[in-house]
Every structure is written in C-alpha cells, then in structure tokens.
Amino acid sequence: QRFAQAQQQLPLESLGWDVAELQLNHTGPQQDPRLYWQGGPALGRSFLHGPELDKGQLRIHRDGIYMVHIQVTLAICSSTTASRHHPTTLAVGICSPASRSISLLRLSFHQGCTIASQRLTPLARGDTLCTNLTGTLLPSRNTDETFFGVQWVRP
Amino acid sequence: QRFAQAQQQLPLESLGWDVAELQLNHTGPQQDPRLYWQGGPALGRSFLHGPELDKGQLRIHRDGIYMVHIQVTLAICSSTTASRHHPTTLAVGICSPASRSISLLRLSFHQGCTIASQRLTPLARGDTLCTNLTGTLLPSRNTDETFFGVQWVRP
Amino acid sequence: QRFAQAQQQLPLESLGWDVAELQLNHTGPQQDPRLYWQGGPALGRSFLHGPELDKGQLRIHRDGIYMVHIQVTLAICSSTTASRHHPTTLAVGICSPASRSISLLRLSFHQGCTIASQRLTPLARGDTLCTNLTGTLLPSRNTDETFFGVQWVRP
C-alpha cells in the first residue's frame, strides 16, 4: 500500500494530467470571430491545471493527445432564430503557431440554439486553440450553457 | 516489467479511477423534474465503480475533477413535437448538499429530439448529481438513447 | 523524482492507454449502412494507439471501460434537407463477435445536420465497433466535421 501513497505524493504534473475548463469572458470586436475565455476558481467552476490563457485563448503546455470539448449556447435564440440567422458556425482550431493552423472541430447551429461536441486530437506545447463563432448571434455567458475545455489523455 | 505488474495489482481505487454509466430507470412523480437512474451489470452495460446511487441520483465518493456526460432522447418525438412543447430543458447539477447546489450543464431541445453534451467539473465526496428534465415530454428508456455518466479525471 | 522518470520509461501499453481517433474514408455500398473509417498520421490528425482497423471498422485490443465518441455531419444539408430526409439515424454498436452484438449509442438528425455524442461502455478484446448511418443522406468527409474515436478509461 506504500506504493499507492508514494504515487499520490508525486507532483501531478509528472503524470501529465493537464486539464482546463473555461467559461466565456467576452466576444471579440467586430471582424474578430474569436470567443475570449476565462478560468480560475474565483470565477466559479472553471480552472486551468497546466494549460494557460493567452489573451483569452487557450495555450497548451504539454505535448500529447487531448480530449477537446465545447458547448456553446446562443444568447437570444429559439429554433426560428437559429434558422433565420443561418449560417451560425462554431469552429475550434489551432490558430498559432501559424505553421500548425488547422480546424479541429466544426459545427453549425441550423435550427438549434446549442452545439456540443468533443474529439481526441494531438496537441503540442505552444499550440494555441481558438474558438471562432461566425454569424450575428451572441453566445450565452451562463457558465452552464457555454464552456470549453481540454483534458490530456496520453503522450 | 515487474513494475507494471505491481501497478496492475494495486486496487484501482487507489488510482482514483471512479467511473459510472447509468441508464434511465424512471421519471419522477409530478412536480419532481428529476430523472431517476439505475446501473449495474445485471441491467446491461451500465455500471458503478466508486460512485453510488442514492434513490436514483448519483452520489460521488471521491474528490476530483470529473468528466460528466449525458445524452437524453425524447420518447415520442419529431422536430415538430419538440418545437411545440418548447421549452423542454435538461439541466445537470449538484443538488445536495444544498450548500453546493449549482447547475453544471444545461441544454434545451428546441427542434431536436436528442441532447448530448459533456463537461469537466470539480466534484467532492458526497456531492449528489441530479438531472432535471422540465417540460411535458418523456425521455426514452432505451439504453442507447438515454444515458448519464461520470469519469474521474484527476485530483 | 526518479520514480516519475521510471514511470515515464514504462511502455505506455502497460498503462492501458489505448486510444484511437478516426476520420471517414467512405460509405458502404448500397444495403451496407456502415461508415468505413481510416486513421494514421499520414492522413492528418487521426491515429490508432492500440485498437486496429479491420476493413474500415474499429477493433478493440484491450479489455476495459472505454469512452466512445462520435460526430457526424451530413454533407449536403440544411435544416429543411434534414427534416425532409427524416429519419436519418446514426448508431454505434458492437457488430462482432455476433454473440456480443449490441447498439451502444443512437441519434437521429431530425432538423439538424450534425450529431455528436459520447458514452462510457465496457469493451472486450476483439470487439469490433460499427457505425451505421441509415437514410439517404451522405456524411461529410471533412476531418473537422466527421470523426469517431475511443479512449480506454480503466480496466
């Protein structure tokens, strides 16, 4: 049983358990489709253990395969709103470094007011993830309706 | 290779791998919006390793950050049904202890008949998770259409 | 600190971190509702670490509880397309061995053009997962719109 205790005393960083869950801070100025995120216990149930925020965008600190997940709910919305404002699309991707820029996950709202998805993807230290919401509708800032997170899964 | 074997002989509990996947048992009586869950190998592919059920609600046994996920499909539903019965909303939250009561995840059905989402959230030993379905539509009890689960991710 | 280094030198296989993320290769011939998947670094951001592909279907190599996730976007689609072609349904299940055949996860598109979900489920070495898309609409092959993956969570 000593072994288990020893394991628990190890710094979690050595196990590579990087994880973050973010809440929406604000949207960008016109012509900037990015969502800007915030996290930390003072804000509620959001947190960053490993990854960091760089001007509201999530930056990865450890190479590995990550589970990336997101939910975005539109703030003023019913099924008719969503379809009339079509296309409203959310895309999550690596936006820097530019050499690694790629769209990882993309969803359109069509007749819904919420999108939610998740995927596994390799990420490298220094990758910055951006979440772009295109269209005229604003996302809800409620922390149970709009959130974005990553979880390190394996090297 | 001895080290790997030693690790596998450790009780999994010491690694903190708490996990549960539940299937719908029944809905509550009128005025009780909660869904009541069940789990265990005798029921099919649902299980509880660590967390427990307390009167159909999921109680956490280990502090940590958890991935919470859910899918709920409405039982007798088409897109017109869903929109006519709007708002039908599902919320997952901590319902006890009362001092920690909070909504973790919220989705409306709008013109769809299924919602599915997931998020990372800190949970503490003794937290009970409730899933509230508000509206007049009933959820499907099919185990591949309606399910709810948690996975311990890190301390 | 030596212990952490020793742990990192262990083959990952001994930790049971099997994981795969696949991209759509093609759909089946008529009367075959299965989606055929592909994965590997040469293809982009898809990969297989542990599980294998068997004629485009995912075969599990290690017993355990897995998180299974999927997103499928219809290729030529608007909310009216989706509703006119209803029912278009996606089901993920164990298709072989026949003795373990079961539907694990099922979603209909209704008025949406994307479905995304995830669940925890026990899988055994040799289980082959199939993803069946029924209906007349084709899935998008864009790697950020349609993907399928599994992650080993615990024994």
């Epitope: 003023i76 800032r141 | 909504s103 | -």
Partner: antibody, heavy 119, light 107 residues
Amino acid sequence: QVQLVQSGAEVKKPGASVKVSCKASGGTFSSYAISWVRQAPGQGLEWMGWISPNSGDTHYAQKFQGRVTMTRDTSTSTVYMELSSLRSEDTAVYYCARDWGSGWYVDYWGQGTLVTVSS
Amino acid sequence: DIQMTQSPSSLSASVGDRVTITCQASQDISDSLNWYQQKPGKAPKLLIYSASSLQSGVPSRFSGSGSGTDFTLTISSLQPEDFATYYCQQSFTTPYTFGQGTKVEIK
C-alpha cells in the same frame, strides 16, 4: 450611440388593448433583442419578454403569455408591444431596452411610456 | 422563477460614505447578475454586469462582487449624484427577474 425612442403616454379602459412602439437608431438591428420591462407606480421592475428584431422571434414571460404580443417592422427599425385585456394593475411605465440575452445584460433603455388603465 | 432579494430596502447615507447593497438569488446563478441605477422619472442605467464588470462610462467608485447566490454592490465614496434606487437583475434564465430595489437617500 444607440437610442430607443418610445411612443407617448396612453390612457385605456379595462378590457382594452394598448400598443406601444419603440424606434431604434444609431446601431445595427441585429445581434440583440428588444426586451420590454414594466414598472408599476412606486414598484420595482418586471421583465415581460423579448423580441429579436432580426428574426421576429419572441420569448414571453409566462405571466404575460396569451396577453402580450411583440412585433417588429424592420423597414423602420421599430418594435411594438401590444398588451390586451387590460386591467387596473397593468397601469405602469413600459420600457423597451436593448437586451444582449442569456448571461448578458440590458444596456440601453427607452425613455418609458406611461400606460394608465382606468374606467 | 428565480427570486431576487435585495437588502436593505432603503438606507440613509452621507456624501463620502461607503455604501454596500446585497442581493440574494433563490438559486445559483453563477455570475449572471447585473446592477442598475434608477433616478425618479428616468429609465434604469446599467452600472455593473456579470457580477463584477464595470459598464463603460460608469465611475470606478462603483464595484460589484459575488458569485452563486450572494452578490454585493459597493459605492466606495458616495457622491451627490448617487442618491437613487438600485436594482439587481439575474440574466441566468428567463424570466429575467429583478430585486425589489434599494433606495439610497441623503441622511
């Protein structure tokens, strides 16, 4: 600078209907909703519902469901709130306001329209 | 519906005083809380949004704090133009609801 200009005061008899207008200028008529909030004399603020000027989509508070109708005219950037089956307790100042929606806030308000219901 | 309870319902204070108004929600609303100031015969004016963010153009003597169910509006040094009624409002879920108001009067 966004401005919301409302129609003038109204006096109505019980059982009648009233239609208040709210004209928007100085901003795009797009991402936000127009909410209606009322305030009875000497009382607090009460949210009635919103309309999305772009889509015409509405969301009403349960309390007013069946009695309130919100509409819009995109050509004049005007939204309307009609309240039917008036009773004396509907006597209030009715405000229109720019509402960013769920999790956000109301930032610009009209000057208010006093509706008096009296026999 | 979510009930919002403000206290006190009224208070008397002098110019230069530090004033604190509290608002309690009947259920957790995270940080989806806004504060408004209203003067007699005028429309409300947004002061604080998302519990603690200062609206553009609002003096920095106004600040907000809190999360979950308990929130506070603080005026660090009361000025003559601050005598008014203050309302909290939740934007967590419809129907959006307001507190009953706190009237700040001159002592």
